[in-house]
């Protein structure tokens, strides 16, 4: 059974992931981003279901494409280089989903823009955090 300290750790990691995703979204999704329109041509795959931490496997599998899109962005939009930012997210995702169980991600038929993709995972983080508090 999860202890209060492990729950607290999970909550902190989710909050960190949430902040990272929100930072990316805020950095790209405004008219001052000269690459926004071209970034919106990139296709992202969405999870069929995202209600548990194991479903973060679907986010992990899309981190490389996410990095490719962020490479288009001007570095001033973010505190870190895309590679470092994605690396940080990857570490958190691996810790949250755990590596001992192998989960096969199922994707929805509809693809999404980077904005829809980030909003979906932001909602996921907020939803899980709310169940922990």
């Amino acid at each position: 059974a999860p202890t209060s300290s492990s729950t607290k750790k999970t909550q902190l990691q989710l909050e960190h992931l949430l902040l990272d995703l929100q930072m990316i979204l805020n950095g790209i999704n405004n008219y001052k981003n000269p690459k926004l329109t071209r970034m919106l041509t990139f296709k992202f795959y969405m999870p069929k279901k995202a209600t548990e931490l194991k479903h973060l496997q679907c986010l992990e599998e899309e981190l490389k494409p996410l990095e490719e899109v962020l490479n288009l962005a001007q570095s001033k939009n973010f505190h870190l280089r895309p590679r470092d930012l994605i690396s940080n997210i990857n570490v958190i995702v691996l810790e949250l989903k755990g590596s001992e169980t192998t989960f096969m991600c199922e994707y929805a038929d509809e693809t999404a823009t980077i904005v829809e993709f980030l909003n979906r995972w932001i909602t996921f983080c907020q939803s899980i955090i709310s169940t922990l508090t």
Epitope: Y31, L36, R38, T41, V69, T111, T113
Partner: antibody, heavy 119, light 108 residues
Framework: QVQLVQSGGGVVQPGRSLRLSCAAS????????MNWVRQAPGKGLEWVTF????????NYADSVKGRFTTSRDNSKNTLYLQMNSLRAEDTAVYYC????????????WGQGTMVTVSS | SYELTQPPSLSVSPGQTATISCSGD??????AYWYQQKSGQAPVLVIY???RRPSGIPERFSGSSSGTMATLTISGAQVEDEADYFC???????????FGGGTKLTVL
């Protein structure tokens, strides 16, 4: 309604210059990046140049680099294309087009203006 | 340089289904957009993000994408659908904006 009205086309000799204008109305022009796209007679569409909402960053197709300059005057809600050292292959209908902020394409187009480069 | 390849022309009878293809290596990771251009007019967006239809575009227009191929389908083509159709996207890195060569659709 949202509109882009173009002017400034015409017939010009090779090596000469021409300036196209694109007047925007019905939306906050200063919030949108803009583009020029051209279409040679009987041919397809070719993206020419891009300018950010504030005019600080520009991008050009290789075919016009060093000869064409895009600019904007947000106080006049107007986009410009200065075309220098014109060549016969620049003969085309030129369209101004707005960059969408919600989808990855051009969502509003001007009516087009014909530029003919001929001696 | 990156290219999007379309058939140059297609002819259908009114009421028939018109299917226009657009091939591009980046499509597994890039959305396709479709513009309709009637003679002497500016292009109009009819499909965006592979399958989505802007408001005001008739339901007979639909789009799909699979692998390296994007497709525009006009179910029950009308005479007023006669136009040039251009697919549009960006290259693999998202750096370059690219139009297909266009497909001239004749409805007669």
């Amino acid at each position: 309604q949202v509109q882009l009205v173009q002017s400034g086309g015409g017939v010009v000799q090779p090596g000469r210059s021409l300036r196209l204008s694109c007047a925007a109305s019905g939306f906050t022009f200063s919030n949108y990046a803009m583009n020029w796209v051209r279409q040679a007679p009987g041919k397809g569409l070719e993206w020419v140049t891009f300018i950010t909402y504030d005019g600080h960053w520009k991008n050009y197709a290789d075919s016009v680099k060093g000869r064409f300059t895009t600019s904007r005057d947000n106080s006049k809600n107007t986009l410009y294309l200065q075309m220098n050292s014109l060549r016969a292959e620049d003969t085309a209908v030129y369209y101004c087009a707005r960059d969408s902020t919600t989808l990855g394409a051009f969502d509003v187009w001007g009516q087009g203006t014909m530029v003919t480069v001929s001696s | 340089s990156y290219e999007l390849t379309q058939p140059p022309s297609l002819s259908v009878s009114p009421g028939q289904t018109a299917t226009i293809s657009c091939s591009g290596d980046a499509f597994p990771r890039k959305f396709a957009y479709w513009y309709q251009q009637k003679s002497g007019q500016a292009p109009v967006l009819v499909i965006y993000e592979d399958t989505r239809r802007p408001s005001g575009i008739p339901e007979r227009f639909s789009g799909s994408s699979s692998g390296t191929m994007a497709t525009l389908t006009i179910s029950g083509a009308q005479v007023e659908d006669e136009a040039d159709y251009f697919c549009y996207s960006t290259d693999t890195t998202g750096t370059h904006r690219v139009f297909g060569g266009g497909t001239k659709l004749t409805v007669l």
